[in-house]
Interface confidence: low
Amino acid sequence: SEVEYRAEVGQNAYLPCFYTPAAPGNLVPVCWGKGACPVFECGNVVLRTDERDVNYWTSRYWLNGDFRKGDVSLTIENVTLADSGIYCCRIQIPGIMNDEKFNLKLVIKPAKVTPAPTRQRDFTAAFPRMLTTRGHGPAETQTLGSLPDINLTQISTLANELRDSRLANDLRDSGATIRIG
């Protein structure tokens, strides 16, 4: 069953997805698609990474985390009701049928006419599972690759908190672990 996330029309939606590269810069291809994960690949691809960088993206869809460290969470900018639906995050681990597939359900709510100034956006559910590997995770990023790491437009406050605070690590650590190799 899908994990559910919510956002309001006009806001940014955040769909978390993580894995841990086996070594710094040793990236696993990832695709994001609109629709449930099919047997292979992603349907209706909106963003794709390869072994070195983001190599395909479409307007309004960005990676807001450090994808070189395995944070391949998707931000959808300025959502509309049409963005509602299932999204597939597929970690394309080498080998036959090794891919990890996460189906995330995005529910878009109409914007409130007069939102309370202190109200935070309503995101629900825990993070999806996190892939990890034996041994040590990647070292702190300095410059791991020959390309800029990230594209980001107006990321939501909550997404910033998730990425920047200890809460993010706590949530990641609480996820089910899958070991590769």
């Epitope: 395909y56 020959s146 390309l147 990321i155």
Partner: antibody, heavy 116, light 108 residues
């Protein structure tokens, strides 16, 4: 909305130092590299280098190693380009640009004139 | 370094004409990392086409891009006066990131 606002024009003498600022707003500063590009009068665009806004680590094109230095003031969401020991041939307009998958947002440019 | 050579350096067209400018790389560029920028006189460059053929929002649909390997092109299907500008190709495939010398499009 995303904006990169650069400091104003500079008139300098050879041998002096100039520091150009680039104030970013409308996005989370440390999630996108900041690139710098030079445009000399009557010439094309030339990539100077970029700085990783999380680690502060810069990378320079070969032609700009030495006298050109990129730095950050992360708390102020501001990137800097400093050129020391200015030469007449540094006369140009310098642009900061958010270096993401492509250079999608640009500052308005800072004109630097070096003349004795 | 990967040298990008644009041609022609200057081109002139009448409104309604179709124009094509090219960008040739000295070594292979992944189509994902070949971009085009538009710069009008006295203004900052703007990302005009990304990843060979994708148009950012706000760029008119009369612009298109194509190519692969070492040869890329930008086409305007029906030139308008507002298209007068210099267009630069740029590659992100490896250091240093390089720009072509630019093609200046003049409108008659």
């Amino acid at each position: 909305q995303i904006q990169l606002v650069q400091s104003g024009p500079e008139l300098k003498k050879p041998g002096e130092t100039v520091r150009i600022s680039c104030k970013a707003s409308g996005y989370t500063f440390r999630t996108a590299e900041m690139q710098w590009v030079q445009k000399m009068p009557g010439r094309g665009l030339k990539w100077i280098g970029w700085i990783n806004t999380r680690s502060g680590v810069p990378k320079y094109a070969e032609d700009f190693k030495g006298r050109f230095a990129l730095s950050l003031e992360t708390s102020a969401t501001t990137a800097y380009l400093q050129i020391s020991n200015l030469k007449n041939e540094d006369t140009a307009t310098y642009f900061c640009t958010r270096g993401t998958y492509a250079m999608d947002y640009w500052g308005q440019g800072t004109s630097v004139t070096v003349s004795s | 370094e990967n040298v990008l050579t644009q041609s022609p350096a200057i081109m002139s067209a009448s409104p309604g004409e179709k124009v094509t400018m090219t960008c040739r790389a000295s070594s292979i560029v992944s189509s994902s990392y070949l971009h085009w920028y538009q710069q009008k006189s006295g203004a900052s460059p703007k990302l005009w086409i990304y990843s060979t053929s994708n148009l950012p929002s706000g760029v008119p649909a009369r612009f298109s891009g194509s190519g692969s390997g070492t040869f890329y092109s930008l086409t305007v299907s029906s030139v308008e006066s507002e298209d007068a500008a210099t267009y630069y190709c740029q590659q992100y495939s490896g250091y240093p990131y390089t720009f072509g010398g630019g093609t200046k499009l003049e409108i008659k």
